[in-house]
């Protein structure tokens, strides 16, 4: 499955929107900084097959979409930017979904790497618990926004996998 060119375009647009969503100076939130431990070591040390990369990317975007679809998120961000950001994520999910569906019929690839799916889920669990602990404060959301931007950039190794022929 070849992901449409629009996918990397959507990814860039999502990042730009996420950058625009910043409402507070990150410097005023230094006391709220937190280490979420994005599983980049696990990802970087692994040569992803295309199907694995697609599944893991889908999980990352799905979790990001869910995170920004909550009532608490709606209260934290400028509505029109949040809607545009969510739409970009939703379109990315559709692109990836179509690819995964194509592969599902095929013999299970090196098991879609459940451990990578779990690593992504645990990462978002840490983010969720942090937001709850900070009572969804504006600074907490700012820290999370910056973290999600970083995680989008970290996932370049996954994106290399997308260009690989299985």
């Amino acid at each position: 499955c070849d992901l449409p060119q629009t996918h990397s375009l959507r990814n860039r647009r999502a990042l730009i929107l996420l950058a625009q969503m910043g409402r507070i100076s990150p410097f005023s939130c230094l006391k709220d900084r937190h280490e979420f431990r994005f599983p980049e070591e696990e990802f970087d040390g692994h040569q992803f097959q295309k199907t694995q990369a697609i599944s893991v990317l889908h999980e990352m975007i799905q979790q990001t979409f869910n995170l920004f679809s909550t009532e608490d998120s709606s209260a934290a961000w400028e509505q029109s930017l949040l809607e545009k950001f969510s739409t970009e994520l939703y379109q990315q999910l559709n692109d990836l979904e179509a690819c995964v569906i194509q592969e599902v019929g095929v013999e299970e690839t090196p098991l879609m790497n459940e451990d990578f799916i779990l690593a992504v889920r645990k990462y978002f669990q840490r983010i969720t618990l942090y937001l709850m602990e900070k009572k969804y404060s504006p600074c907490a959301w700012e820290v999370v926004r910056a973290e999600i931007m970083r995680s989008f950039s970290f996932s370049t190794n996954l994106k290399k996998g997308l260009r690989r022929k299985d």
Epitope: Q63, N66, L93, L96, V104, F124, L129
Partner: antibody
Framework: QVQLQQPGAELVKPGASVKLSCKAS????????MHWVKQRPGQGLEWIGE????????IYNENFKSKATLTVDKSSITAFMQLSSLTSEDSAVYFC????????????WGQGTLVTVSA | QIVLTQSPAIMSASPGEKVTLTCSAG???????LYWYQQKPGSSPKLWIY???NLASGVPARFSGSGSGTSYSLTISSMEAEDAASYFC?????????FGSGTKLEIK
């Protein structure tokens, strides 16, 4: 509000198969993995596996790989679990439970379907 | 797989008594992924405590959870009749996800 509807009971003959359903409502079906859990009478809970309704990918507990097959039908917002080659060991209540994070992990369960395997 | 052992299997407590249920993991579980569920006969399990120590919505404040590594516990500071139920610990720190065999808590 989030609801997962499961039929109350299924009576099946040994060696046969059964397909259990779990109809979701109150949330976007494709946004959350759906899990299946087994509970034998008076016993603990066993995780069978999970499926992402968005694209149909599955992750199984090795112990159930040859027993259970998880599928979804997005048009009817329903998750299914097929159990094959049934024996008395498979007589149990089977629950579906929605994934999520933090306080949403397994926060929503179906009522469970009691499967009785009997000649 | 991570085996979760719960003890005792069955216990009874008088109203007002302090109760502690334990869950021991065969290998280390990160506390963020250790959950507790309450189940009453004929019903599906209910999320009771998430990430070791956080009470789920609607759970009375007399309940608390603690622990780390391989040792976790659920405590009721003062037993009430409505607390009589089975309690299961659960981990999703690694595949396959597992549940403890449960502790059945009865009221004296």
């Amino acid at each position: 509000q989030v609801q997962l509807q499961q039929p109350g009971a299924e009576l099946v003959k040994p060696g046969a198969s059964v397909k259990l359903s779990c109809k979701a409502s109150g949330y976007t079906f494709t946004n959350y993995w759906m899990h299946w859990v087994k509970q034998r009478p008076g016993q603990g809970l066993e995780w069978i596996g999970e499926i992402n309704p968005s694209h149909g990918r599955t992750i199984y507990n090795e112990n159930f790989k040859s027993k259970a097959t998880l599928t979804v039908d997005k048009s009817s917002i329903t998750a299914f679990m097929q159990l094959s080659s049934l024996t008395s060991e498979d007589s149990a209540v089977y629950f579906c439970a929605r994934g999520g994070l933090g306080p949403a992990w397994f926060a929503y369960w179906g009522q469970g379907t009691l499967v009785t395997v009997s000649a | 797989q991570i085996v979760l052992t719960q003890s005792p299997a069955i216990m009874s407590a008088s109203p007002g008594e302090k109760v502690t249920l334990t869950c021991s993991a065969g290998s280390s579980v990160d506390s963020s992924y250790l959950y507790w569920y309450q189940q009453k006969p004929g019903s599906s399990p209910k999320l009771w405590i998430y990430s070791t120590s956080n009470l789920a919505s609607g759970v009375p404040a007399r309940f608390s959870g603690s622990g780390s590594g391989t040792s976790y516990s659920l405590t009721i500071s003062s037993m009430e009749a409505e607390d009589a139920a089975s309690y299961f610990c659960h981990q999703w720190s690694s595949y396959p996800f597992t549940f403890g065999s449960g502790t059945k808590l009865e009221i004296k």
